[in-house]
Interface confidence: low
Amino acid sequence: AGVFELQIHSFGPGPGGAPRSPYSARGPCRLFFRVCLKPGLSEEAAESPCALGAALSARGPVYTEQPEAPAPDLPLPNGLLQVPFRDAWPGTFSLIIETWREELGDQIGGPAWSLLARVTRRRRLAAGGPWAGDIQRAGAWELRFSYRARCELPAVGTACTRLCRPRSASRCGPGLRPCAPLEDECEAPPVCRAGCSLEHGFCEQPGECRCLEGWTGPLCMVPVSTSSCLGLRGPSSTTTGCLVPGPGPCDGNPCANGGSCSETPGSFECTCPRGFYGLRCEVSGVTCADGPCFNGGLCVGGADPDSAYICHCPPGFQGSNCEKRVDRCSLQPCRNGGLCLDLGHALRCRCRAGFAGPRCEHDLNDCAGRACANGGTCVEGGGAHRCSCALGFGGRDCRERADPCAARPCAHGGRCYAHFSGLVCACAPGYMGARCEFPVHPDGVSALPAAPPGLRPGDPQRYP
């Protein structure tokens, strides 16, 4: 057992980030943070529960944003975020920190929450070690924080799996290690040999690396082969002098929290005590009081560890803990080729020319279903359809390449150039304008000290 502690140092715009508050013109608000811990370094499914635990910070001080003021570091809640863990500290874990903004204006139905930033870090961390600092960017925001894991007595060690007992305690009990010579006290964990496995090794003296059952090698990285068990299914332990089973599916009892293991073909099954669940009974009896629902999800049931909780997720989120943002645009709400934009608080459709409405559902002309290629625009006239083609294209459906300068748009000897954003005319001396159609009056005087960047006399008049 132990506690994961997170200290937020600052949250604000990062270097090169939003120079002004992106929430200007809103009323007073305050920040709070959510932390979610998941075991392992693997890319877990986003909706997997916060199996190691979750915590919610207190609300920070009320902050009224100034529309024209630069966004400062925002005022933070006081104190640590603490996530207790009942079982072994896994050493490798995923840390998810969410920064939430609570608007305190006159909201219908109470305060409005919005997620400002989410950072996810996969880390190795030994329990009992010093604070680890980190700086993470999320969009234009920057979050500075420190974290550590510490064991709570009587647990000790880098995984909080060693239990401090009087020296008389058995040396062969499962998972037990003798304490320091001083009666009923635990010594500070020694520094193990560099590279010693956090999961499978431990040390009682600085510089050593001693292996847990089932593992061997100088750094405890090598699983013990079952073929070496020679009928006993295991060699004598080099760490205790006791005979221990070799690595079968239930060896070392993979079931946490007092779960009992039974072997199945090629695997195992845990029967968990009340209040625990999961493949290895690693998920403790989370209740709604633990705040397991992210992103404003509503927790129901789960009043005690024996009853399961259910998270009812707000629009835009899903998963057992509402951790996963729904791709709302995958529902394709925009018709007629409109582009779907998820603005966070709402969806918006950016409509193609000729269409309008919240879902681009209104046809503005009789060109619906008419496809003009290469950026051409369908235009109506007398009930007939036709395409008005973009520069460089022609034909009935704008599928044929055309020389945009073939029409000789530049007057008075100007030279035509096709530019990605249109035609430009390089005018002969004495002429100006989009098509060099205007003679330059001799009274013309420069109003600015320099030509546009890269533009010289005789260069195109229309600089992109």
Epitope: G422, A434, E437, A447, P452, R462
Partner: antibody, heavy 120, light 107 residues
Amino acid sequence: EVQLVQSGAEVKKPGASVKVSCKASGFTFTDYYMHWVRQAPGQSLEWMGLVYPYSGDISYAQKFQGRVTLTVDTSISTAYMELSRLRSDDTAVYYCARQGNYVNNAIDYWGQGTLVTVSS
Amino acid sequence: DIQMTQSPSSLSASVGDRVTITCKASQNVGNIIAWYQQKPGKSPKALIYLASYRYSGVPSRFSGSGSGTDFTLTISSLQPEDVATYFCQQYSDSPYTFGQGTKVEIK
């Protein structure tokens, strides 16, 4: 929001000069040509000339050569049109208008107009 | 200078009618023409550029067509707020020139 705000109405005597201002906002002034167009009472629109604020280049319609002067002050995003040696047939509403600087662009925004009355 | 000749000079139609205004250039201007709407006492408002492209915010009942020397502005279903004078303008060559205008009224 694109806005072109012109100075107020003027009453002038024949032979005098008038200077009308046009303050631009809501867009980058130096990226657009600024045109001046006038409209006599009950008549059509008549193009007078243009100025390109970026470079100060100007072009006048032949009819107004020698009588009209177009200037800009880029520091305050303002264009000016001065018409001298006024005659009674110069009585009109004078408009400033902007035009983007690509081949396809037409005049797209107009000021509200300034009525200049020339009367003895 | 390029002359722009509009017809008719005025017309009266009923709400919902299809209205067509034509503009003829004295020489080929490609599709470099624009159409403007001017309501009484107001400044002109741009409707169409490059002969057939509507500006943002212009109702879809307004459409333009034509190229070379002959151009048309069509109001597919006349509305009371369309009462105005409509001008064509070529911006192909200097000096820019306008048609003399077509005054549209409701019957």
